[in-house]
Amino acid sequence: IVLRPSRVHNSEENTMRALTLKDILNGTFSYKTFFPNWISGQEYLHQSADNNIVLYNIETGQSYTILSNRTMKSVNASNYGLSPDRQFVYLESDYSKLWRYSYTATYYIYDLSNGEFVRGNELPRPIQYLCWSPVGSKLAYVYQNNIYLKQRPGDPPFQITFNGRENKIFNGIPDWVYEEEMLATKYALWWSPNGKFLAYAEFNDTDIPVIAYSYYGDEQYPRTINIPYPKAGAKNPVVRIFIIDTTYPAYVGPQEVPVPAMIASSDYYFSWLTWVTDERVCLQWLKRVQNVSVLSICDFREDWQTWDCPKTQEHIEESRTGWAGGFFVSTPVFSYDAISYYKIFSDKDGYKHIHYIKDTVENAIQITSGKWEAINIFRVTQDSLFYSSNEFEEYPGRRNIYRISIGSYPPSKKCVTCHLRKERCQYYTASFSDYAKYYALVCYGPGIPISTLHDGRTDQEIKILEENKELENALKNIQLPKEEIKKLEVDEITLWYKMILPPQFDRSKKYPLLIQVYGGPCSQSVRSVFAVNWISYLASKEGMVIALVDGRGTAFQGDKLLYAVYRKLGVYEVEDQITAVRKFIEMGFIDEKRIAIWGWSYGGYVSSLALASGTGLFKCGIAVAPVSSWEYYASVYTERFMGLPTKDDNLEHYKNSTVMARAEYFRNVDYLLIHGTADDNVHFQNSAQIAKALVNAQVDFQAMWYSDQNHGLSGLSTNHLYTHMTHFLKQCFSLSD
């Protein structure tokens, strides 16, 4: 059992109090992390508590204010970006959120050499994306779906694209589906390492069907939001990649990068772009049926001013048991020879590991191996490769940082983090300075998070960047629940679970059980991280036992578990939650008449199917913003796991796996269905169809909609949501208010 957080024993039990819902909604026990904004090997920027932007020099130990809070405040800046030549800073204000990553903003350029804002040729507003070149102070930005370039901030802009059109053609920024399901960024342009070239994607959404929903606002008539959104089987965006010489942009203009022939023969996606040198670029492409990925290395041909992608530099990654990659196809990390690279993909045993590719994928040298998975390659230097994995002590829900010395033979491996703060820290990420001279470690738990600075050569800890002392003190008089992470072995499947137990847990007593589920492909819920959240409150104050279970389809435990759900979503994920509940009942401390399940998004889908499983296990449950039919969800995500909703492909399972098909089975459970009406991601349509099916089946249920709220149900809706769900659960479990 992991007691969290560790603290001095307080004999005066009466000074301890349980968590309240108010604590959670107010974010009273939220933690801070410290990610340095590296600007060189030994310098980083950080926004101080009083909002000054401060430069820290690790070598000298000195700090310098580079931008005062007054300057930030003068334009209401909420973010900043320093040009690599240190001459200018952009200040970002008027932030206006669009989708998950995208937003528009107003940008001001501040000249650090004279302490004044740049006047003349000011940037238009609002801008969709803006970034500095990696060297100097060139600016690339996207305005009204077109890309512009400035050689210096005060110069007039050079317009690179002219065909940009709202909801039709997107240049340098992704459309909805590429943003959410493929790139996971707000941008689709990439500078070459020294800023000579600028690569960008053009997305043509002209033929994509549009999702339309009402935004009620305050006006007499609601607005209609229209988003080109390809649902499963629908027409997809057409993508093209161009590269322009930023030194002489008007000379030959943008040059298109050719698509590999084996990809171009049918519908395809562009998945990522990685610059290798100023004249070599690596593009990754994916067939619409997402089990074949091609990595293509292209070179600039000076004589023709074009980009050449020889077949000999095409590397194919194919999955025969599922889809290519994990959630996404991994990206390469190139070595110093500018042709060979390191990449994570499945080994012959079906575990994702680091491989070194020098000529062909077939001849790849496996760098890591074992019945665990390499998760992320952070940095490759001339003598070291830093990566994270869940190898240590065979807990898939942990993350430790490792260093492999690639300069020596045979390469030696060292766990950098495994024994640093073993009880407190088992889940790390890292942030490296140039050439990995220094790095920051951010530990997320299971104890109170802590961020530390380390020497990249010796791994020695230099200083603590953030240790959340205030949080530690605030928690001293709180009765936190106990947490345990264990596993169940069922029919050759390992089900890892996290159980959150009331503070005075007594194995001889019976407790209501709440299952919190996500369960989406390549997700992981059972992680050794710190959190004081709604379920912490339910355990601490309301005496519930909460369990999270990672079943089939979840990540980082090998392809057998991951790809088990391929082409049959909604079956094994549900089965495994039910199996786990039965095992929990066998443990003897669960009141089997008071078991509930809840989930959000994919979790809402799984919780709905579990409630409608006809097992009689669940008394009640909640689905927040659930998917109800895979025909309603985005093509890129859905087809990755389900194939196409066509007769000759997988239409039958698309139809069999809907929540609506099981409407009758909700008759014997209490069901609370919740959705935001302005959900751009999982459309309100999903819940509308569940509700219609339940009404048609004359099944009683409870529902709550949140007007004009998206998939995140943020702001005041959050408070209302958790208060409402708490009342529902307490009523279901017969707990007094």
């Epitope: 060189s40 090997g41 030994q42 310098e43 101080s48 000054n52 401060v54 430069l55 070598e59 000298t60 130990g61 000195q62 700090s63 310098y64 204010t65 580079i66 005062s68 007054r70 320093l82 690599p84 030549d85 240190r86 650090l112 050499s113 060297v135 140039d434 050439y435």
Partner: antibody, heavy 119, light 111 residues
């Protein structure tokens, strides 16, 4: 406009201490570090150290470690540099200089304070 | 510490001529693509004045005839056409490593 006004000339005996002041105006003191540099007669310049006004954090040239102390009085926008255990070779013009951290450059200088160490 | 050597010690030129001042560092002062070499001008009885920072960036109010270049260990200050007020002592200085150090100076005098 930016001005750094230093205290007047000092004559000190060997072994004594000297405290030179530098009053900043025309900008917000806490926005820039203050460095101190000295110049012996007919010689080049020598960096003494740096102070970060927000926290009072300092870095000193190892050569002066243990003998130099830099402090700040935010209420009067004044920075002080004290040098102890003076010897004849400390005779020099002492300058305070505004240090622009992002460029590691000393962009504005005080008029200088002449310190003479003589028995 | 990093030692900066300036040459020549004295440069005798006439107004209108081009002046090229050299500064050599005992070790590289490159910091990940940036070189923190600064140049100062000093006239008798006055404090130094910042001319060039970060190798090639002109300080506030510095005329365009002053330019800086170089990387690694070798740096140059160029005055394209000497004006009467340019006759002074010029110092290079590195801020790449503590202690920050100055060169011995180059005196530009009227021929």
């Amino acid at each position: 406009q930016v001005q750094l006004v230093q205290s007047g000339a000092e004559v000190k005996k060997p072994g004594a201490s000297v405290k030179v002041s530098c009053k900043a105006s025309g900008y917000t003191l806490t926005d820039y570090n203050m460095d101190w540099v000295r110049q012996a007669p007919g010689k080049s310049l020598e960096w003494i150290g740096d102070i970060y006004p927000n926290t009072g954090g300092t870095i000193y040239n190892q050569k002066f470690k243990g003998r130099v102390t830099m402090t700040i009085d935010k209420s009067t926008s004044t920075v002080y540099m004290e040098l102890s255990s003076l010897r004849s070779e400390d005779t020099a013009v002492y300058y305070c200089t505004r240090f622009r951290g992002i460029h590691y450059a000393m962009d504005y200088w005080g008029q200088g304070t002449t310190v003479t160490v003589s028995s | 510490e990093i030692v900066l050597t300036q040459s020549p010690a004295t440069l005798s030129l006439s107004p209108g001529e081009r002046a090229t001042l050299s500064c050599r560092a005992s070790e590289s002062v490159d910091n990940y693509g940036l070189s923190f070499i600064n140049w100062f001008q000093q006239k008798p009885g006055q404090p130094p004045r910042l001319l060039i920072y970060g190798t090639s960036n002109r300080g506030s109010g510095i005329p365009a005839r002053f330019s800086g270049s170089g990387s690694g260990t070798d740096f140059t200050l160029t005055i394209s056409s000497l004006e009467p007020e340019d006759f002074a002592v010029y110092f290079c200085q590195q801020s790449n490593e503590v202690p920050y150090t100055f060169g011995g100076g180059t005196k530009v005098e009227i021929k």
